[in-house]
C-alpha cells in the first residue's frame, strides 16, 4: 500500500545514546520530508527511540537487524516490505514520548484512529525484523532507575518516543524510504513454529521458538548507589516524561473495554524527564484487547487519559 503523502509525522530533535542491539527488535528510517534524518529504534520492551544514523553503533545495529531478518527469511519465513508513511503499529503511548519529539497527525485523508487487532500467539511471534521480536510482552516493564552515569550523559533517558503496545501484529509500520535496503521497515514474517502448549498457569515458554543466535552477595544488605538500580517491590516504576502527564506503561496490561483518550498538550523542550517509581495502588491496563485512540489534529504533544475498565487493577505484586 503506497500512500501519496509522505508528510513527516515523527520529528526527532534529540537522539538516544547507544543501546545494545541485543535489546532491539526493529528499526525504521523516518521520512526524507522530516529534514533531519533519524532511525527509529524499537526495543524488546516496545519502546521507541530516535537514533542518529551517522553513529557507528546505529549502523552496526541496523546491519545486525538486517542480517537477522535475512536469516529469518532463509529459514522459511516470509518477509513483506511495505512502502508508505511511517506509522506506528498502534497508538503511541505519550507517557514515553520525549519532549523533543513531535508526532504529526495523519496526512493521508485516512482516519487517524489506530485500531490494532488482537493477535494470536503465533502471529505475535511472527512479526518483526528478527526472531528476537518479543511482541508478547504484556505488562512487564523493564523500566527502572538507570545507572547514574547514563542518566547524566543524556543516554536513552529522555529520548524515548513512545512505547508501542505489543497488542497487534496485524498492523505494520510503513517506510517512506523506498531506497532503504532490506528489512528497514515493519514486516510480517511468517514462521512455521508452533505456539507453546505448556500449562499457561506456569507462564511457560518453550524452546521451540527459533533463536539465532546478580551477583547476589551472600553476605550483607545491598546498598544502592551510583551504577546500581533499586528494585522497588511494590511500585509501578513508570516513566514520566517531562510535562506530559502520562506514563510509558500506559498501554501495558489493558483489560477489555479499556479506552485511551488522546488529546494534545504543549510539549516543553526543557526539563529532564525523571524515572521515579510511582506509588503502588495505581492501575495499569491490559494489553490483550484493541486500543482505540484518536489524534487531535492540533498537535504539539500527546496527553493520554486512560479509562480503565471496572476490573483494572495493579499488575505488580
Amino acid at each position: 500500500q503506497h500512500h501519496g503523502v509522505t508528510k513527516c509525522n515523527i520529528t526527532c530533535s534529540k537522539m538516544t545514546s547507544k543501546i545494545p542491539v541485543a535489546l532491539l527488535i526493529h528499526y525504521q528510517q523516518n521520512q526524507a520530508s522530516c529534514g533531519k534524518r533519524a532511525i527509529i529504534l524499537e526495543t524488546r520492551q516496545h519502546r521507541l527511540f530516535c537514533a542518529d544514523p551517522k553513529e557507528q553503533w546505529v549502523k552496526d545495529a541496523m546491519q545486525h537487524l538486517d542480517r537477522q531478518a535475512a536469516a529469518l527469511t532463509r529459514n522459511g519465513g516470509t518477509f513483506e516490505k511495505q512502502i508508505g508513511e511511517v506509522k506506528p503499529r498502534t497508538t503511541p503511548a505519550a507517557g514515553g514520548m520525549d519532549e523533543s519529539v513531535v508526532l504529526e497527525p495523519e496526512a493521508t485523508g485516512e482516519s487517524s484512529s489506530l485500531e490494532p487487532t488482537p493477535s494470536s500467539q503465533e502471529a505475535q511471534r511472527a512479526l518483526g525484523t528478527s526472531p528476537e521480536l518479543p511482541t508478547g510482552v504484556t505488562g512487564s516493564s523493564g523500566t527502572r532507575l538507570p545507572p547514574t552515569p547514563k542518566a547524566q550523559d543524556g543516554g536513552p533517558v529522555g529520548t524515548e518516543l513512545f512505547r508501542v503496545p505489543p497488542v497487534s501484529t496485524a498492523a505494520t509500520w510503513q517506510s517512506s524510504a523506498p531506497h532503504q535496503p532490506g528489512p528497514s521497515l515493519w514486516a510480517e514474517a511468517k514462521t512455521s513454529e508452533a505456539p507453546s502448549t505448556q500449562d499457561p498457569s506456569t507462564q511457560a515458554s518453550t524452546a521451540s521458538s527459533p533463536a539465532p543466535e546478580e551477583n547476589a552477595p551472600s553476605e550483607g544488605q545491598r546498598v544502592w548507589g551510583q551504577g546500581q538500580s533499586p528494585r522497588p517491590e511494590n511500585s509501578l516504576e513508570r516513566e514520566e516524561m517531562g510535562p506530559v502527564p502520562a506514563h510509558t506503561d500506559a498501554f501495558q496490561d489493558w483489560g477489555p473495554g479499556s479506552m485511551a483518550h488522546v488529546s494534545v498538550v504543549p510539549v516543553s523542550s526543557e526539563g529532564t524527564p525523571s524515572r521515579e517509581p510511582v506509588a503502588s495502588g495505581s492501575w495499569t491496563p491490559k494489553a490483550e484487547e484493541p486500543i482505540h485512540a484518536t489524534m487531535d489534529p492540533q498537535r504539539l504533544g500527546v496527553l493520554i487519559t486512560p479509562v480503565p475498565d471496572a476490573q483494572a487493577a495493579t499488575r505488580r505484586q
Epitope: 535489546l23 511471534r125 508478547g136 523493564g142 527502572r144 532507575l145 528494585r231 516504576e237 524515572r275 505484586q317
Partner: antibody
Framework: EVQLVQSGAEVKKPGATVKISCKAS????????IHWVQQAPGKGLEWMGW????????KFNERFKGRVTITADKSTNTAYMELSSLRSEDTAVYYC???????????????WGQGTTLTVSS | DIQMTQSPSSLSASVGDRVTITCRAS??????LAWYQQKPGKAPKLLLY???TLAEGVPSRFSGSGSGTDYTLTISSLQPEDFATYYC?????????FGGGTKLEIK
C-alpha cells in the same frame, strides 16, 4: 535484599531431563529478565537464554536451542530452566541471574543464584 | 556470534602489584562489556559494566578501559582477596558471550 535461590544438586542419566528452579525475592519478579548461564567443570561461562516472566518470547543461545525450556511461575516468583536429552557434556553448574539496568542499558548480570550442580552420568 | 578472547589465561602476581587483563572481541561491541570476578564454588560477581562503570561496592582499585574491540581490566594494587578468576562478557548482541577467563594466582 534481592536474592535468587536455586534448587539443589541433581544427578541424571544420559537422555533424561532436568528442571532447575530459581526463586526470586526482593524485587518485582515480572519486571526483570531472568537469564541462565552454564559453567562446565574447569570451563568458562556460557549464556543459555533469557526470559521475562509472563512474556512468551524467550531468547535462546543457538547451542541450547531445542533442548532448553525456560518457564516461570509468577505466583511463587520462581523461574525454571529445563534441559532435556541430557548428555555427559551437560555436566555443569547452572546459574540463574538477572540483568538490573534500565531496559536500554543492556544485560549484564548483577544478581546471581548460588548455582545448581548437574551431574550427567550413566 | 561475537567471540571474546581473554588474555592471559593465567597470571601470577603478588600483593601490591598492578595487573592488567585484556579482552578482545571479534567484532565491535560498543563498550557493552562487563567484568566479573569468580572465586571457587561461588557465583560470579559483577565488577564493571558499560563504559567502565564500577559496580556498587567494588573497590576503586578496579578500573576498566578500552573501546571498539579491545578492553582492559586493571587492578591497581592487588589485595589478598583479589586472587580469583576474572571473566569479561559482551552484551552488545546475542548470544551473550564470555571470555575464557583469567586465573589470577599468588606468586
Amino acid at each position: 535484599e534481592v536474592q535468587l535461590v536455586q534448587s539443589g544438586a541433581e544427578v541424571k542419566k544420559p537422555g533424561a531431563t532436568v528442571k532447575i528452579s530459581c526463586k526470586a525475592s526482593g524485587y518485582t519478579f515480572t519486571n526483570y529478565y531472568i537469564h541462565w548461564v552454564q559453567q562446565a567443570p574447569g570451563k568458562g561461562l556460557e549464556w543459555m537464554g533469557w526470559y521475562l516472566p509472563g512474556d512468551d518470547s524467550p531468547k535462546f543461545n543457538e547451542r541450547f536451542k531445542g533442548r532448553v525450556t525456560i518457564t516461570a511461575d509468577k505466583s511463587t516468583n520462581t523461574a525454571y530452566m529445563e534441559l532435556s536429552s541430557l548428555r555427559s557434556e551437560d555436566t555443569a553448574v547452572y546459574y540463574c541471574a538477572t540483568s538490573p539496568t534500565d531496559e536500554t542499558q543492556g544485560d549484564y548480570f548483577d544478581y546471581w543464584g548460588q548455582g545448581t550442580t548437574l551431574t550427567v552420568s550413566s | 556470534d561475537i567471540q571474546m578472547t581473554q588474555s592471559p589465561s593465567s597470571l601470577s602476581a603478588s600483593v601490591g602489584d598492578r595487573v592488567t587483563i585484556t579482552c578482545r572481541a571479534s567484532g565491535r561491541i560498543h563498550d557493552f562489556l562487563a567484568w566479573y570476578q569468580q572465586k571457587p564454588g561461588k557465583a560470579p560477581k559483577l565488577l564493571l559494566y558499560t563504559d567502565n562503570t564500577l559496580a556498587e561496592g567494588v573497590p576503586s582499585r578496579f578500573s576498566g578501559s578500552g573501546s571498539g574491540t579491545d578492553y582492559t581490566l586493571t587492578i591497581s594494587s592487588l589485595q589478598p582477596e583479589d586472587f580469583a578468576t576474572y571473566y569479561c562478557q559482551q552484551f552488545w548482541s546475542t548470544p551473550y558471550t564470555f571470555g575464557g577467563g583469567t586465573k589470577l594466582e599468588i606468586k
